[in-house]
């Protein structure tokens, strides 16, 4: 079936903006006014992947940009990355299950868990002007909470 | 080889309970999903709702007050409970295992039990 | 959810006919429709899987096609043990859904 996509911005519980930082990485930092429009627009796809009641998979994709966040191993730890696609394939219903991250409502807030590693959130730092990351606890020290701001196409 | 065996079926009063097993072998429950299914004598077939490898769960909405499907993993054996029952919950219930092909596959099924009957009459 | 209209509800045929089955669904499912052989008193056992691919050991005489909304399973020469009744299960979305059945008879 055609793949079900829709554009928004993330902001963390902190109300930190996503920005790009060089070309293969995201970072959370504080934007006001006219700033604001460095924060990246996803396109948020509704993908398959293993649904129940509460969770709903879905893909983060760059708007207009062929690159998705994906989850991988690097030096044996699950780690968040943007990868690069091709963008005659994507995206597709059927994305692999490194591009897949389950969208957790909970309190009016959102938690991105990764499908290929379970229990591994989507996570910003407290600090200012860190890298997005792949986060292996909850309720810690780092963020995993988001609101999603929805953007016309 | 890939067996899936139902049981626990029976006669259940009106107002009741129920709660099936289904045995597996020849997978994972931890890789593999598993769906409960039913059939009305002489109907169709109804999806109920499954359970993950990773144990979270999807419930068709009409029944999804009075199901829980739930695994034990080391016992390789999948449980639906199923409460209220009345006499249109008379079914033979089926146990099936999804194929859980990433990116190809996800929710098909391919291998089923045998069912087990159960009879919900005062 | 999506719907699965499957027709007819029952088939009369003879051995060696060829015969057809129509399943459309309420949204576009790709290529994610399935089919079912159910005997009485039997699981219902997968025929064919999406992708209108033939299980193994399947005999060649069964066949599908179709993709988005509309889908056809097609026996092309009867046999005596292929009377039972045939279902389709889209499997592009949960709720995973059914169609009502297709009870193959001897004419």
């Known amino acids: 079936a055609p793949v079900r996509s829709l554009n928004c911005t993330l902001r963390d519980s902190q109300q930190k903006s996503l920005v790009m930082s060089g070309p293969y990485e995201l970072k959370a930092l504080h934007l006001q006014g006219q700033d604001m429009e460095q924060q990246v627009v996803f396109s948020m796809s509704f993908v398959q992947g293993e649904e129940s009641n509460d969770k709903i998979p879905v893909a983060l994709g760059l708007k207009e940009k062929n690159l998705y966040l994906s989850c991988v191993l690097k030096d044996d730890k699950p780690t968040l990355q943007l990868e690069s696609v091709d963008p005659k394939n994507y995206p597709k219903k059927k994305m692999e299950k490194r591009f897949v991250f389950n969208k957790i409502e909970i309190n009016n807030k959102l938690e991105f868990e990764s499908a290929q590693f379970p229990n591994w959130y989507i996570s910003t730092s407290q600090a200012e002007n860190m890298p997005v990351f792949l986060g292996g606890t909850k309720g810690g020290q780092d963020i995993t909470d988001f609101t999603m701001q929805f953007v016309s196409s | 080889e890939v067996q899936l065996v139902e049981s626990g079926g029976g006669l259940v009063q009106p107002g009741g309970s129920l709660r099936l097993s289904c045995a597996v072998s020849?997978?994972?429950?931890?890789?593999?999903?598993v769906s409960w299914i039913r059939q009305a004598p002489g109907k169709g077939l109804e999806w109920l709702g499954l359970?993950?490898?990773?144990?979270?769960?999807y419930y068709n909405s009409p029944l999804k007050s009075r199901l829980t499907i739930s695994k034990d993993n080391s016992k390789s054996t999948v449980y639906l409970q199923m409460n209220s029952l009345r006499a249109e919950d008379t079914a033979v219930y089926y146990c099936?295992?999804?194929?859980?092909?990433?990116?190809?596959?996800?929710?098909?099924?391919?291998?089923w039990g045998q069912g087990t009957l159960v009879t919900v009459s005062s | 959810d999506t719907q699965v209209t499957q027709s007819p509800s029952s088939l009369s045929a003879s051995v060696g006919d060829r015969v057809t089955i129509t399943c459309i669904t309420s949204?576009?499912?790709?290529?994610?429709m399935n089919w079912y052989q159910q005997k009485p008193g039997k699981p219902p056992k997968l025929l064919i899987s999406?992708?209108?691919t033939l299980r193994p050991g399947v005999p060649s005489r069964f066949s599908s096609s179709g993709s988005g909304t509309d889908f056809t399973f097609t026996i092309s020469s009867l046999q005596p043990e292929d009377f039972a009744t045939y279902y389709c299960?889209?499997?592009?979305?949960?709720?995973?859904?059914f169609g009502q059945g297709t009870k193959l008879e001897i004419k």
């Open positions: 099936a295992k999804q194929r859980t092909l990433w990116g190809y596959d996800l929710y098909g099924m391919d291998y």
């Open positions: 949204t576009d499912i790709d290529v994610d």
């Open positions: 020849g997978f994972t429950l931890s890789d593999y999903g």
């Open positions: 999406q992708g209108n």
């Open positions: 359970i993950w490898g990773g144990g979270d769960t």
């Open positions: 299960l889209q499997s592009d979305n949960l709720p995973l859904t």
